[in-house]
C-alpha cells in the first residue's frame, strides 16, 4: 500500500497472507472456514496461508496449508478479466475474534462509496519496501466511465476502480488478492494498477466481487 497507514490492530480479521515458503506472495480474504478468496493471477501449486495476525511472519498466527485452488474458468492471462480465485484450505480455520469470515456483498456499491483496502504489499515504488505490519488505505469507488478515461480498453466490465483524486494512496505489488471493503462488505479484490505505483489520478483496479457471488457460492458448494 502506497501512502497508507498502519491498520488498527484486529480490524481486518478476514485478511490473510498467501505465503510462498515464508515470503509474501499475495493477500487474500477469508470467506468461510475452508475457503479464501484471492486474485487468479496469484495462483501457485500450493500455499501457506497465514491468518489471525496483522504482522507478516507472526509465529503466533494460524498457518494452514492449502493445496487446491480454483481459478474462475473465464480468467484470461491475456486480458486479465475474471481475476478471481478460491483457495481451499487443507483444514478448517479456528474462528476467533482475530479470525473471521468477511461478509460477501448483497449488492454492488455505487461510485463515491468510501472503502478501505489493506495489504502487506510494498509501501514504495519502484524500489520496494515490504512492511511487517498490515497497511490500510481509505479510497472511494470510481465510476467505470471515469476509470475508462485512464485505462481505456484494459478495463473490463467486471473490474472496479478506486482511489482518491490527486492522491498517491493506492495498492501495489504484494497487495494482489487482498480485500477492498465498503460498508462492511467485500466489494473488491486487488488486481492491478499503474506502475510505478502511486501515480496520482491513476486508480487502483479491483475485481468486482458483487458480480461473482454466484460463482463463489457454487464453487464452494461443488468442492466442499
Amino acid at each position: 500500500i502506497i501512502d497508507g497507514y498502519k491498520c488498527k490492530e484486529g480490524s481486518h480479521p478476514w485478511q490473510v497472507a498467501l505465503l510462498k515458503g515464508n515470503q509474501l506472495h499475495c493477500g487474500g480474504v477469508l470467506v468461510d472456514k475452508y475457503w479464501v478468496l484471492t486474485a487468479a493471477h496469484c495462483k501457485m501449486g500450493q500455499y501457506q496461508v497465514q491468518l489471525g495476525s496483522d504482522k507478516i511472519g507472526d509465529q503466533s498466527a494460524q498457518k494452514i496449508k492449502a493445496t487446491k485452488s480454483f481459478r474462475h474458468p473465464g480468467y484470461s492471462t491475456k486480458t486479465h478479466v475474471n481475476d478471481i480465485m478460491l483457495v481451499r484450505l487443507d483444514e478448517p480455520v479456528k474462528m476467533s475474534s482475530k479470525v473471521e469470515a468477511v461478509q460477501l456483498p448483497e449488492h454492488c456499491e455505487p461510485p463515491g462509496t468510501s472503502c478501505t483496502v489493506s495489504g502487506w504489499g510494498t509501501t514504495t515504488s519502484p524500489d520496494v519496501t515490504f512492511p511487517s505490519d498490515l497497511m490500510c488505505s481509505d479510497v472511494k469507488l470510481i465510476s467505470s466511465r471515469e476509470c475508462k478515461k485512464v485505462y481505456k480498453d484494459l478495463l473490463g466490465k467486471t473490474m472496479l476502480c478506486a482511489g482518491i483524486p490527486d492522491s498517491k494512496t493506492n495498492t501495489c505489488n504484494g497487495d494482489s488478492g487482498g480485500p477492498l471493503v465498503c460498508n462492511d462488505t467485500l466489494q473488491g479484490l486487488v488486481s492491478w494498477g499503474t506502475y510505478p505505483c502511486g501515480q496520482p489520478n491513476d486508480p487502483g483496479v479491483y475485481t468486482q466481487v458483487c458480480k461473482y457471488k454466484r460463482w463463489v457460492m457454487e464453487t464452494m458448494k461443488t468442492h466442499r
Epitope: 486479465h80 481475476d83 501495489c172 505489488n173 488486481s191 492491478w192 494498477g193 499503474t194 506502475y195
Partner: antibody
Framework: QLQLQESGPGLVKPSETLSLTCTVS??????????WVWIRQPPGKGLEWIGS???????YYNPSLKSRVTISVDTSKNQFSLKLSSVTAADTAVYYC????????????????????WGKGTTVTVSS | DIQMTQSPSTLSASVGDRVTITCRAS??????LAWYQQKPGKAPKLLIY???SLESGVPSRFSGSGSGTEFTLTISSLQPDDFATYYC??????????FGGGTKVEIK
C-alpha cells in the same frame, strides 16, 4: 546494480534445440512486476522479440516463434531460460536477455513493457 | 502485428549537429514507445521510454516526442559518443513487441 548474463552453447546443429540461460545478479528475479525477456539479433539485422516470462511462470511468446519456444524460470537459482526447438540457419543470431519494466503491475504486468537492463548477449550459430 | 518504420535508415552528421530520427507505427500505440542506442558488438541501451521520458543517467541532449503513430528522437548537439545505431520499440500492443529497422548515425 542489476546485471544479466547469458550462457549456453555457441554452436547448435540444425534440427536440434537451442538452450540458453540468463543469470540475474544484483537483484531478485522474484521482484514482481518485472518481465524477464529474450530478444535476438541476426547478424547485421535488427532486433526481434522472442518472448518473456513473469516470476510466477506466466509466459508470452512471439506468435511467429510460439510453436518452437519455451521460456522457463527458476527463482531459486535466480535464472530464466530459453529453449528454441528445430533450429535452422535462420536462427543464427546474438541472443540477449533483458529485464522488462511494465506499465502496469499485478494481473496486467505483462502489458506494455520496455527493456531497461540488458545482458551482453551471446552468439549462437546454427551449423552442421 | 504493428509494423514500425524508421527513417532515415542511415544518417551522416557532424559533431555538434542537431539530429532527428523518425519512427512511424502502422497503428496507434498511444505513447508506448521506447528508443535504444546500440554500438557495434554491444547490447542495446535504453534512452527514452513512454515516448518522451528520459531514462536515468542518459544525457539531456537526447529527447523524444510524439504520440499515436508518429514519433521522433532528437539529439540536440551530436557528440562523438553518439555515433551508433538507434532503434525504436513499440510496446503498445499486447503481443508481439516490435522494433523499427534501425537508424545508423555515422560521421559525415
Amino acid at each position: 546494480q542489476l546485471q544479466l548474463q547469458e550462457s549456453g552453447p555457441g554452436l547448435v546443429k540444425p534440427s536440434e534445440t537451442l538452450s540458453l540461460t540468463c543469470t540475474v545478479s544484483g537483484g531478485s528475479i522474484s521482484s514482481s512486476p518485472y518481465n524477464w525477456v529474450w530478444i535476438r539479433q541476426p547478424p547485421g539485422k535488427g532486433l526481434e522479440w522472442i518472448g518473456s516470462i513473469l516470476h510466477s511462470g506466466s509466459t508470452y511468446y512471439n506468435p511467429s516463434l510460439k510453436s518452437r519456444v519455451t521460456i522457463s524460470v527458476d527463482t531459486s537459482k535466480n535464472q530464466f531460460s530459453l529453449k528454441l526447438s528445430s533450429v535452422t540457419a535462420a536462427d543464427t543470431a546474438v541472443y540477449y536477455c533483458a529485464r522488462g519494466v511494465p506499465t502496469y503491475w499485478g494481473a496486467a504486468s505483462h502489458y506494455y513493457y520496455y527493456m531497461d537492463v540488458w545482458g551482453k548477449g551471446t552468439t549462437v550459430t546454427v551449423s552442421s | 502485428d504493428i509494423q514500425m518504420t524508421q527513417s532515415p535508415s542511415t544518417l551522416s552528421a557532424s559533431v555538434g549537429d542537431r539530429v532527428t530520427i523518425t519512427c512511424r507505427a502502422s497503428q496507434s500505440i498511444s505513447s508506448w514507445l521506447a528508443w535504444y542506442q546500440q554500438k557495434p558488438g554491444k547490447a542495446p541501451k535504453l534512452l527514452i521510454y513512454k515516448a518522451s521520458s528520459l531514462e536515468s543517467g542518459v544525457p539531456s541532449r537526447f529527447s523524444g516526442s510524439g504520440s499515436g503513430t508518429e514519433f521522433t528522437l532528437t539529439i540536440s548537439s551530436l557528440q562523438p559518443d553518439d555515433f551508433a545505431t538507434y532503434y525504436c520499440e513499440q510496446y503498445g500492443s499486447e503481443s508481439p513487441l516490435t522494433f523499427g529497422g534501425g537508424t545508423k548515425v555515422e560521421i559525415k
